[in-house]
Interface confidence: low
């Protein structure tokens, strides 16, 4: 007869490992006992369990409650055992020694490999601001056995760098994602993807990018200069910008206080029926936590009685 086993048994941390040992004998042969031992190189054999055809299962105190026979129905020639709740320390070499009659003893070895799935963590980098150079967006770390694979899934353009630290029974892999922040990245997902043989599917951790920025300011409303004449109603100036966080707006007049009757409503400056006193230089100040911008315009209210043209001067400043 001969023993049937596996060269390598692979199990995920916390799962039950079946250590196979089956004697395929000739007709009439019987198995008297099967002895299991841990036989790591450089160490003496450590008894694990004994399956006896008459006396049943014996388990070493070191493995009490963790070694069982497979559930029935059992073949009397099957000396396999279950190692419950595998831990990293269980990884190593095991030997089954089968005593048969009348054929004698047989032995076989197998290696138990315990996979330790990673528990990845994602850590965002410093606050992202438009105008920065290459900046750390996030780092992702995963430790397992064997070493996990850490990659990134994103439509954002960037560069990655990885480093690995080996421990006695595992390895930690850290991957960093660097990018040059731009406003188009706002709200884009940056996903760390961790692959490992102990995972049924890749683990994914998504971080949403937030990039602070403030666009240049401009003022709309003076496009048709002929509309800015004495008596016109509903005249308004609108300050245009965008930012993250959303900006706030403030209106001032460079050459004096805002005329009475002029209404400030956020980004909009509303005028009462126009008079010449509304002529002047108006400044829109846009700001958020990231930056501030100014845009100024010159309003020249035309008097229809006069045949002089109006000049509009647009100036933007940061």
């Amino acid at each position: 007869g001969e023993l049937e086993t596996s060269d390598v048994v692979t199990v995920v941390l916390g799962q039950d490992a079946k250590l196979p040992c089956f004697y395929r004998g000739d007709s009439g042969e019987q198995v008297g006992q099967v002895a299991w031992a841990r036989v790591d190189a450089g160490e003496g054999a450590q008894e694990l369990a004994l399956l006896h055809s008459k006396y049943g299962l014996h388990v070493s105190p070191a493995y009490e409650g963790r070694v069982e026979q497979p559930p029935p129905p059992r073949n009397p020639l099957d000396g396999s055992v279950l190692l419950r709740n595998a831990v990293q320390a269980d990884e190593g070499e095991y030997e089954c020694r089968v005593s048969t009659f009348p054929a004698g003893s047989f032995q076989a070895r197998l290696r138990l490999r315990v996979l330790v799935p990673p528990l990845p963590s994602l850590n965002p980098g410093p606050a992202l601001e438009e105008g920065q150079g290459l900046t750390l967006a996030a780092s992702c770390t995963a430790e397992g056995s064997p070493a996990p694979s850490v990659t990134w899934d994103t439509e954002v353009k960037g560069t990655t760098s990885s480093r690995s630290f080996k421990h006695s029974r595992s390895a930690a892999v850290t991957s960093e994602f660097h990018l040059v922040p731009s406003r188009s990245m706002n709200g884009q997902p940056l996903t760390c993807v961790v692959s490992h043989p102990g995972l049924l599917q890749d683990q994914r951790i998504t971080h949403i990018l937030h990039v602070s920025f403030l666009a240049e300011a401009s003022v709309r409303g003076l496009e048709d200069q002929n509309l800015w004449h004495i008596g016109r109603e509903g005249a308004m100036l609108k300050c245009l910008s965008e930012g993250q966080p959303p900006p706030s707006y403030n209106w001032t007049r460079l050459d004096g206080p805002l005329p009475s009757g002029v209404r400030v409503d956020g980004d909009t400056l509303g005028f009462p029926p126009l008079t010449t006193e509304h002529s002047g230089i108006y400044v829109c100040h846009v700001s958020n936590e990231f930056s501030s911008r100014d845009s100024q315009v010159t309003v020249d209210v035309l008097d229809p009685q006069e045949d002089s043209g109006k000049q509009v001067d647009l100036v933007s400043a940061s």
Epitope: S121, L122, P124, C192, R204, I205, I208, H210, Q244
Partner: nanobody, 118 residues
Framework: EVQLLESGGGLVQPGGSLRLSCAAS????????MGWYRQAPGKERELVSS????????HYADSVKGRFTISRDNSKNTLYLQMNSLKPEDTAVYYC???????????WGQGTQVTVSS
């Protein structure tokens, strides 16, 4: 155990409004970004809006800009999505998502159905 529980969905006529809420429990800190995703039948899940841990940074998908407003109340561990001027194409299951940067975990709610129809 971390749980995200959405509420506030329902049936609304075009042009109407809804306010979605997402109550987070089991999270020991408010230091995490959150977002609203939606998934219409036969389509991929898409990000609608997201908000930073402080609430100071927000983002909106182009399709909802000017109509939806995201906010959060960290004292109540609750995320909100105010949806105005709703359109039939806003019909979807809306999911709340918490992106826990300091543990690397990513938690999802079970979703709440929003139907916009006359």
């Amino acid at each position: 155990e971390v749980q995200l529980l959405e509420s506030g969905g329902g049936l609304v006529q075009p042009g109407g409004s809804l306010r979605l809420s997402c109550a987070a429990s089991g999270l020991t800190s408010s230091g995490y970004a959150m977002g609203w995703y939606r998934q219409a039948p036969g389509k991929e899940r898409e990000l609608v809006s997201s908000i930073s841990s402080s609430g100071g940074l927000t983002h909106y998908a182009d399709s909802v800009k000017g109509r939806f407003t995201i906010s959060r109340d960290n004292s109540k561990n609750t995320l909100y999505l105010q949806m105005n001027s709703l359109k039939p194409e806003d019909t979807a299951v809306y999911y709340c998502d918490a992106d826990i940067a300091y543990t690397g975990a990513d938690y999802w709610g079970q979703g709440t159905q929003v139907t916009v129809s006359s």
